[in-house]
């Protein structure tokens, strides 16, 4: 779905970290920890040497609710985005890199330590490059892994 | 197999509300989208709202969100549908119909239908 | 709300005929858009989804296409049972919105 700019399952875990509140994670994984601005996830994925991953994504879209479930409801998904600094939005940032081929929902962009935009780790449509569907979750695994493992081959 | 059994016939007199069931089968129940669509006498197809029966998160018609309230018991895997202050225009058949298996919005299986009739 | 115009509102053709129905959307849609066929006194079935995918025990001889806002659905050659009401729905926003219809009858 386009969008123009617009203002802004629970993981079975023994973890012991307090629940966030639902108004970070957005139900995007209410146990994981969600960075609040752009701004703070591209400071801490600097600074941790963590990749980044960012989900643009509209309350009112029901692409965007459909692709929150199953990435909620999928543990591995989950497991792994612990070691992404994370951010969900649901208004556009002013960095045009974040929206390499258009403002649609949802979509899921990766950013290097660097602060390099990986526009090479794409979804499967030539014409929303970035965007995912719930059948898409095996693509977008694999594509966390290979965020993360280029991460470490840069090192 | 995939089955959406849904409950039979009602008739209502105006400003009542009615309570149509939609009990599923075949599938893991709280990971699709449950749709509610309508279809009155000799016209289109109409749709209503969803429902993620995993969690309870709907999203309605803005036509219907007054009056609809869109309900899932987990234990039952059964999902509802409730109208109220029913009108003669609300006469029709509703239909529940799944989301994709893998959690799409896309409409895949249908209820046959449970004809609401509304009259004084 | 989107608003979805089939046409033609009644195709008038033979069994062997090649059908072809149309959908067309106010506005981009991508390629959220389904088929499907209805028969008097039954439930709607899925035919097709995301504007090309065919529904499993589907036949082939049904399909799909079109992106943005122009969309068909083509039956390659009508078999009797084909004789129906068609629809298409847009599932790119909320709310869903179907087509008028389109009603494949005995020429």
């Known amino acids: 779905r386009d969008t123009t700019v617009k203002p802004g399952a629970k993981k079975d875990t023994k973890d012991s970290r307090p629940k966030l509140p639902q108004t970070l994670s957005r139900g995007w994984g209410d146990q994981l920890i969600w960075t609040q601005t752009y701004e703070e996830a591209l400071y801490k994925s600097k600074t941790s040497n963590k990749p980044l991953m960012i989900i643009h994504h509209l309350d009112e879209c029901p692409h965007s609710q459909a692709l929150k479930k199953v990435f909620a409801e999928n543990k591995e998904i989950q497991k792994l985005a612990e070691q992404f600094v994370l951010l969900n939005l649901v208004y556009e940032t002013t960095d045009k890199h974040l929206s390499p081929d258009g403002q649609y929902v949802p979509r899921i962009l990766f950013v290097d330590p660097s602060l390099t935009v990986r526009a090479d780790i794409t979804g499967r449509y030539s014409n929303r490059l970035y965007a995912y569907e719930p059948a898409d979750t095996a693509l977008l695994l694999d594509n966390m892994k290979k965020a993360l493992k280029l991460l470490k081959t840069e090192l | 197999q995939v089955q959406l059994v849904q409950s039979g016939a009602e008739v209502k007199k105006p400003g009542a509300s009615v309570k149509v069931s939609c009990k599923t089968s075949?599938?893991?129940?709280?990971?699709?989208?449950m749709n509610w669509v309508r279809q009155a006498p000799g016209q289109g197809l109409e749709w209503i709202g969803w429902i993620y029966p995993g969690d309870g998160d709907t999203n309605y018609n803005g036509k219907f969100k007054d009056r609809v309230t869109l309900t899932a018991d987990k234990s039952t895997s059964t999902v509802y549908m409730e109208l109220s202050s029913l009108r003669s225009e609300d006469t029709a058949v509703y239909f529940c119909?799944?989301?994709?298996?893998?959690?799409?919005?896309?409409?895949?299986?249908w209820g046959q239908g449970t004809l609401v009739t509304v009259s004084s | 709300e989107i608003v979805l115009t089939q046409s033609p509102a009644t195709l008038s053709l033979s069994p062997g005929e090649r059908a072809t129905l149309s959908c067309k959307a106010s506005?981009?849609?991508?390629?959220?858009l389904s088929w499907f066929q209805q028969k008097p006194g039954q439930a709607p079935r899925t035919l097709i989804y995301r504007a090309n995918r065919l529904v499993d025990g589907i036949p082939a001889r049904f399909s799909g296409s079109g992106s943005g806002q122009d969309f068909t659905l083509t039956i390659s050659s009508l078999e009797p049972e084909d004789f129906a009401v068609y629809y298409c729905l847009q599932y790119d926003e909320f709310p869903f919105t179907f087509g008028g219809g389109t009603k494949v009858e005995i020429k």
């Open positions: 119909a799944r989301g994709g298996y893998d959690g799409s919005p896309w409409l895949s299986y």
């Open positions: 506005q981009d849609i991508n390629s959220y």
């Open positions: 075949g599938y893991v129940f709280s990971r699709s989208w």
